[in-house]
Interface confidence: medium
């Protein structure tokens, strides 16, 4: 008979006890505490918050709580030499300047150290030239401009609206197009929901609000000066010219009041279609340059930010496992914010704090988890996922041998409509079954399960009666754990209704208006959505750390592998002649997927039947489950992206936030019709099919009977 050796205590110490201990009122209190002043990475304020969290986690009952510090490259505006953009006349006089700061929200007028809007890691420079409007600056937007409209961005300053893709991809695309500067702005079409008032009267972006953010293209490298290794006391640092992922042209963000002044004068080509028009009362002409009367005027950028090696601090808390202390389940989220962090990250950090408190309460009553739980408060996430990546680089040997799972805990909410989950297929079953056990917080679903409301509001596109679960991309701290190390990972938060709200993210994202009051007044006054997210994240951690058999179902990986193979095959089949000419076959991949499916099915049967009272056999089966995600890692990484090593998933090369399946094959096929050497290009497709097929087959074999 199965038993739980970890517990020799009263019956009440189970997941229900853990979940019942989580309180909305505590999350609210913690959020308030974490959002009263800015906690920008590398500042004294954020160091003090790290020490406060360390102290409180110790009080909550964790076995140990340590600070882990690193010296990484960060970026700050020059306090005496502000960044701005001008319209200049033919004499070089500045006839219009963009604002130097956001008007502070009510009650925050006297707060010091509010960093003005800037694009982190922009180089210094004062380029001037004609403006070209490039829509969202996506790959397809530049294709439209350059190939269809024959507009050349070389030597131009481009203006792009935020949204759809990660801002770093926009800047990379602009650089490749030859631009000499980039202006990023928030268009009301993307950041102003109809029928909702601007902050402080609602949750919409006011005209003076601006989105901050980094513009790096790190591809998982972490600190730009120490790729692959921790930025510790004896680190060898690259020179700035060799740093990873830094932009080469000046970049600056503005709000829609300032954008109006730049865009209203635009001349040149009309927008190619309605998808290029936002909601401002401007023509959305593409340019280049201003129209008629204003054709002699130019745009000039003034960027004086500096890159500085600065100390950052992670907080790492440990709750030692009673039976398998050498198996780690990690719950991590970042602490650093651009300004107050009302949603990003402190709505997540407050939830982590309450989860730690609940686990600590159980521990004080004599309970321990079966496996070790690590809790992390990451620093410098906003500057490129630096804190989590450096810690993982420092501890990579431990993590790759002992890491069971990583659950991410950034913003708990980006809306209040329904649940949103992105995770490895290994966790689908866990998420489904956990959410069936949690009560839905949604209006109209009283007494119903979270699974029911989630499935109703966000149905799976493939499987009826099931909710949508998305692929992991990047843009958050799970990246190094999943994409580099191959540790099963997941994330959950409450989100908006994507059907009715087409704006990108939430309107006040990374602005000064992301305050405690934004959450308390407009998003979650009762903190019931925060509590639900705490239950999902905490429940996943509890089950991953405590379940005798790991709650991973390898059959779900088999299902998605077939789906992804079908998808990439259909993309390739858009070129039937070339596939024939160059003898491109997907047979090896489909064969590997078939083998994986059969072996996973047999493994699952053995998992049902084996003797769980035999600790050696139990550990063996659990190790096969734990190492399955690891088996999808290619030590050589993806082409030109050595730190993205997962063969099944990687962040899209065109949008860091999005996940792409079979990314090696996908990138080899992308725009293949435009390649100058088709033979070489299709050769690379064949090589990527070979790598994918081999990896799937090798992963399948890890699930076979061991002897």
């Amino acid at each position: 008979k199965s038993s739980n050796e970890a517990t020799n205590i009263t019956p009440k110490h189970n997941m229900k006890a853990f979940l019942d201990e989580l309180k909305a009122e505590n999350i609210k209190k913690f959020l308030y505490n974490f959002t009263q002043i800015p906690h920008l990475a590398g500042t004294e304020q954020n160091f003090q918050l790290a020490k406060q969290i360390q102290s409180q986690w110790k009080e909550f009952g964790l076995d140990s709580v340590e600070l882990a510090h690193y010296d990484v490259l960060l970026s700050y505006p020059n306090k005496t030499h502000p960044n701005y953009i001008s319209i200049i006349n033919e004499d070089g006089n500045e006839i219009f300047n963009t604002s130097l700061f956001e008007p502070p929200p009510p009650g925050y007028e006297n707060v010091s150290d509010i960093v003005p809007p800037f694009s982190a890691f922009s180089p210094q420079g004062m380029p001037e030239g004609d403006l070209v409007y490039v829509n969202y600056a996506r790959t397809e937007d530049f294709f439209k401009l350059e190939r269809d409209m024959k507009i050349n961005c070389s030597g131009k300053i481009v203006i792009a609206r935020y949204g759809k893709v990660f801002r770093g991809n926009k800047v990379k695309n602009a650089q490749l197009a030859g631009a000499k500067g980039v202006i990023l702005y928030s268009d009301p079409a993307d950041y102003f929901a109809p029928g909702v008032k601007s902050y402080p009267d609602g949750w919409n972006l006011p005209g003076g609000g601006v989105q901050r953010g980094n513009i790096l293209n790190l591809n998982g490298a972490g600190d730009p000066l120490t790729p692959g290794y921790p930025a510790n006391e004896y680190a060898y640092r690259r020179g700035i010219a060799e740093a990873v992922g830094l932009p080469s042209i000046p970049v600056h963000p503005i709000g829609y009041y300032d954008a109006q002044k730049l865009l209203e004068k635009m001349g040149g080509s009309a927008p190619p279609d309605s998808s290029w028009r936002g909601s401002l009362k401007v023509p959305y002409n593409v340019g280049p340059g201003f129209t008629g009367n204003f054709s002699t005027q130019k745009v000039k950028m003034h960027i004086h930010s500096t890159n500085e090696v600065t100390r950052i601090y992670n907080v790492i808390g440990t709750l030692r496992g009673a039976v398998e202390p050498d198996r780690y389940v990690i719950l991590g989220g970042h602490r650093d914010s651009w300004v107050f962090g009302g949603i990003d990250p402190q709505s997540g950090a407050a939830v982590v704090h309450e989860i730690v408190r609940s686990f600590g309460t159980l521990k004080k009553e004599g309970w321990r988890p079966r496996r070790t739980i690590l809790f992390a408060s990451w620093d410098a996430e906003e500057f490129g996922l630096l804190g989590s990546t450096e810690w993982a680089e420092e501890n990579s040997r431990l993590l790759q041998e002992r890491g069971v799972a990583y659950i991410n805990a950034d913003s708990s909410i980006e809306g209040n409509y329904t649940l949103r989950v992105d995770c490895t297929p290994l966790m689908y079953s866990l998420v489904h079954n956990l959410t069936k056990e949690l009560k839905s917080p949604d209006e109209g679903f009283e007494g119903k399960s979270l699974y029911e409301s989630w499935t109703k509001k966000s149905p799976s596109p493939e499987f009826s009666g099931m909710p949508r679960i998305s692929k992991l991309g990047s843009g958050n701290d799970f990246e190094v754990f999943f994409q580099r190390l191959g540790i099963a990972s997941g994330r959950a938060r409450y989100t908006k209704n994507w059907e009715t709200n087409k704006f990108s993210g939430y309107p006040l994202y990374h602005s000064v208006y992301e305050t405690y009051e934004l959450v308390e007044k407009f998003y979650d006054p009762m903190f019931k959505y925060h509590l639900t997210v705490a239950q999902v994240r905490g429940g996943m951690v509890f089950e991953l750390a405590n379940s005798i058999v790991l709650p991973f179902d390898c059959r779900d990986y088999a299902v998605v592998l077939r789906k992804y193979a079908d998808k990439i095959y259909s993309i390739s089949m858009k070129h039937p002649q070339e596939m024939k000419t160059y003898s491109v076959s997907f047979d090896s991949l489909f064969s590997a997927v078939k083998n994986f499916t059969e072996i996973a099915s047999k493994f699952s049967e053995r998992l049902q039947d084996f003797d769980k009272s035999n600790p050696i056999v139990l550990r063996m089966m659990n190790d096969q489950l734990m190492f399955l995600e690891r088996a999808f890692i290619d030590p050589l990484g993806l082409p030109d992206r050595p730190f993205y090593r997962h063969v099944i998933y990687a962040p899209s090369s065109h949008n860091k936030y999005a996940g792409e399946s079979f990314p090696g094959i996908y990138d080899a096929l992308f725009d293949i019709e435009s390649k100058v050497d088709p033979s070489k290009a299709w050769g690379e497709v064949k090589r990527q099919i070979y790598v994918a097929a081999f990896t799937v087959q090798a992963a399948a074999e890890t699930l076979s009977e061991v002897a």
């Epitope: 199965s2 997941m15 866990l430 056990e437 009560k439 399960s449 089950e543 709650p551 049902q608």
Partner: nanobody, 126 residues
């Protein structure tokens, strides 16, 4: 180990009611699903009903739907089966079962590796 002790069985006339109880003790930590399985003389074990730890998820077999109700009192670590409108074909030994599977596709499907009680006899006879 987990001990499961059933009670409440007996002889009853058709159309009448019985309430079975199952008290769980020992290391009941991590028990997510509890349920009832019955075995009539000379027949295979048959699933009757199951309930998850939150009580949000209950499953009752088609053969007893509308007549039997399963419930659980976590504070007392006790499982109940309210049996109404009993029929002769409900005669069987009723076993309480418990599982620590949260994640299986068939969460209600008890097998030999789960915890079982000794059973209580229910006889429906006029």
């Amino acid at each position: 180990q987990v001990q499961l002790v059933e009670s409440g069985g007996g002889v009853v006339q058709p159309g009448r009611s019985l309430r079975l109880s199952c008290a769980a003790s020992g290391r009941t930590f991590g028990i997510y699903v509890m349920g009832w399985v019955r075995q009539a003389p000379g027949k295979e074990r048959e699933f009757v009903a199951a309930i998850s730890w939150s009580g949000l998820n209950r499953l009752v077999s088609d053969s007893v739907k509308g007549r039997f109700t399963i419930s659980r009192d976590n504070s007392k670590n006790t499982l109940y089966l309210q049996m109404n409108s009993l029929r002769a074909e409900d005669t069987a030994v009723y076993y309480c079962a418990a599982s620590n599977r949260l994640y299986g596709r068939t969460w209600y499907d008890f097998n030999e590796s789960d915890y079982w009680g000794q059973g209580t006899q229910v006889t429906v006879s006029s």
